[in-house]
């Protein structure tokens, strides 16, 4: 009977299979290029199990390799639009705690009006991913064409 | 001998790795923006490991969360060519049932020729997905350059 | 004791999370449209856990599905430089053994200075992946605008 | 192995205008800008402007307000530089120059160089 | 415009020794990972001639004497062993962005 149970628990206890997908609840103040995430089924399609959400910020629980990845697709935007309002730069980073702040994606949207990626990168439990869109034009909140998310790959 | 079967096992059977990766087959009919998709050995580097496909459409068998990505190029394309024909658009989604039906992602090629994103979302036994793709330019067959694809991540 | 050994090595050694995330190192020799890579702790966030680097290329030591993701951003680049430079092409294969040489996943940048993409593909020990961009830029060397990783996802 | 062969030497008057071609050979003209750099006597480099031979695009130093016109005519595989409104300081040596295999403004190739003289 | 300043304007060496020349540009000349910084020789009555790329890169067919190190706004030429044939006036150029400009040359001569 332990046996099985152990089985059970196997992928997501000692795996840890922590997994998150996030939409975009709203931007920062002014002076604040950050984008400011939720997660949970009643929103949507989202979800958090393992990390969790510190005022808009994806916080890591568990040490481990990554895959992170996002999606931003700016709102009421054409080729035209986007290219006047060059640059604008999506960069997701480890943002606190600072000693292990950096920058681990980054893109222009140039003449595009979305911008799409992923990466593995290490991550530690405590570690705060912070995503940044500098520029003067909004994001879109349709959560089929803004989100983030990551998925613990391995120890 | 039984507990060791069970180790090898688990993986693939208790654990569920369900997977694919789809080339373009064909584009539907007139009115039908739905791309068809097929997939195994006997086309080159596609397959299905747990999913199939239903008339061109990609069926889930296993409930969890998924990783779905998809990269489509347009055939013969430059940037003059895309932005003349704006707005080309790609939209993953749920098609069936009816009652789960949901946009999952969505891009606009604006000035480029490629489009390439993923996500993370939740799928179910029996969910369909749809590949919408709306507007006048065709989608290269190219196995490198058009491709569809699901990974089962967690229950 | 045994059992409890096995439970612990499962994931690693059994299931053979192999994952390699690489930095760009350098651009071939003036013929060689190569892009030559590097990776481990020492260099920052890059690793390699399974395959190696042979000559700057990804060798792959164990069969599987593998998810493939490459990003890569040009240097000094606005969506002018772009446009005036196409075709840039970055296309992502099957270099060696010659036998088994294919091309994977291809982008051309069009009017963009990024590319990023990735894809589900059957891979085998022994499997060297090269990344070959054509054009006359150069790629950034910076780690968040250009790196290529691949991840072991099921047998 | 890539020549750009200029043209020959000129003798202008002051307020008139120069032409200097510089015709390539050896490589795929399209698909690299050709660069116009001058050396007055004794005096060190100046960068002058660039043409994109592919669709014409033109990038120019400020520095010479308009006075410098850079073309290019693909079927010949040939690069223009014409200088207006001479002064006797416009006297150097004119290089057409280009990069062997990046895009970028360092250069590899350069022509054997062309002087003008300003003078009355 | 970025500035390119040369050390010194000129320079005498003895046959065999080591040369250095120094390039400061006003402001970075780095960006995506590469020093946008070259180095070119040129002899009397002849055009530049590319030594370096992209601030340490050997230019084919350049004698492996010659080399280029720096990042950000200071770089440097060495000459590892002077030659006769290495007297000539060197300049530094940057392609950071456009325009493209020179340092004022620094004279290399034999001591």
């Known amino acids: 009977q332990r046996f099985a149970q152990a089985q059970q628990q196997l992928p997501l206890e000692s795996l840890g299979w922590d997994v998150a997908e996030l939409q975009l609840n709203h931007t920062g103040p002014q002076q604040d290029p950050r984008l400011y995430w939720q997660g949970g089924p009643a929103l949507g399609r989202s979800f958090l199990h393992g990390p969790e959400l510190d005022k808009g910020q994806l916080r890591i629980h568990r040490d481990g390799i990554y895959m992170v990845h996002i999606q931003v697709t700016l709102a009421i935007c054409s080729s035209t639009t986007a290219s006047r309002h060059h640059p604008t730069t999506l960069a997701v980073g480890i943002c606190s705690p600072a000693s292990r702040s950096i920058s681990l994606l980054r893109l222009s949207f140039h003449q595009g009006c979305t911008i799409a990626s992923q990466r593995l990168t290490p991550l530690a439990r405590g570690d705060t991913l912070c995503t940044n869109l500098t520029g003067t034009l909004l994001p879109s909140r349709n959560t089929d064409e803004t989100f983030f998310g990551v998925q613990w790959v391995r120890p | 001998q039984r507990f060791a079967q069970a180790q090898q096992q688990l993986p693939l059977e208790s654990l569920g790795w369900d997977v694919a990766e789809l080339q373009l087959n064909h584009t539907g009919p007139q009115q039908d923006p739905r791309l068809y998709w097929q997939g195994g050995p006997a086309l080159g580097r596609s397959f299905l490991h747990g999913p199939e496909l239903d008339k061109g459409q990609l069926r889930i068998h296993r409930d969890g969360i998924y990783m779905v990505h998809i990269q489509v190029t347009l055939a013969i394309c430059s940037s003059t060519t895309a932005s003349r024909h704006h707005p080309t658009t790609l939209a993953v989604g749920i098609c069936s049932p009816a009652s789960r039906s949901i946009s999952l992602l969505r891009l606009s090629f604006h000035q480029g020729c490629t489009i390439a994103s993923q996500r993370l979302t939740p799928l179910a036994r029996g969910d369909t997905l749809c590949t919408n793709l709306t507007g006048t330019l065709l989608p290269s067959r190219n196995t490198d350059e058009t491709f569809f694809g699901v990974q089962w991540v967690r229950p | 004791q045994r059992f409890a050994q096995a439970q612990q090595q499962l994931p690693l050694e059994s299931l053979g999370w192999d994952v390699a995330e690489l930095q760009l190192n350098h651009t071939g020799p003036q013929q060689d449209p190569r892009l030559y890579w590097q990776g481990g702790p020492a260099l920052g966030r890059s690793f390699l856990h399974g395959p190696e680097l042979d000559k700057g290329q990804l060798r792959i030591h164990r069969d599987g599905i593998y998810m493939v993701h490459i990003q890569v951003t040009l240097a000094i680049c606005s969506s002018t430089t772009a446009s005036r430079h196409h075709p840039t092409t970055l296309a992502v294969g099957i270099c060696s053994p010659a036998s088994r040489s294919i091309s994977l996943l291809r982008l051309s940048f069009h009017q963009g200075c990024t590319i990023a993409s990735q894809r589900l593909t059957p891979l085998a020990r022994g499997d060297t992946l090269c990344t070959n961009l054509t054009g006359t830029l150069l790629p950034s060397r910076n780690t968040d605008e250009t790196f290529f990783g691949v991840q072991w996802v099921r047998p | 192995e890539v020549q750009l062969v200029q043209s020959g030497a000129e003798v202008k008057k002051p307020g008139s205008s120069v032409k200097v071609s510089c015709k390539a050979s050896?490589?795929?003209?399209?698909?690299?800008?050709m660069h116009w750099v001058r050396q007055a006597p004794g005096q060190g480099l100046e960068w002058m402007g660039a043409?994109?031979?592919?669709?014409?695009?033109?990038s120019y130093n400020q520095n010479f307000k308009g006075r410098v016109t850079i073309t290019a005519d693909k079927s010949t595989s040939t690069a223009y530089m014409e200088l207006s409104s001479l002064r006797s300081e416009d006297t150097a040596v004119y290089y057409c120059?280009?990069?062997?295999?990046?895009?970028?403004?360092?250069?590899?190739?350069w022509g054997q160089g062309t002087l003008v003289t300003v003078s009355s | 415009d970025i500035v390119m300043t040369q050390s010194p304007d000129s320079l005498a060496v003895s046959l065999g020794e080591r040369a250095t020349i120094n390039c400061r540009a006003s402001k970075s000349v780095s960006s995506s990972g590469y020093s946008f910084m070259h180095w070119y020789q040129q002899k009397p009555g002849q055009p530049p001639k590319l030594l370096i790329y992209?601030?340490?890169n050997l230019e084919s067919g350049v004698p492996d004497r010659f080399s280029g190190s720096g990042s950000g706004t200071d770089f440097t030429l060495t000459i590892s062993s002077l030659q006769a044939e290495d007297v000539a006036v060197y300049y530094c150029?940057?392609?950071?962005?456009?325009?493209?400009?020179f340092g004022q040359g620094t004279k290399l001569e034999i001591k």
């Open positions: 050896g490589g795929t003209f399209s698909r690299y800008n």
């Open positions: 043409i994109f031979p592919g669709n014409g695009e033109t």
């Open positions: 992209l601030a340490d």
């Open positions: 150029q940057h392609s950071r962005e456009f325009p493209p400009t």
């Open positions: 120059a280009r990069n062997s295999y990046y895009d970028y403004a360092w250069f590899t190739y």
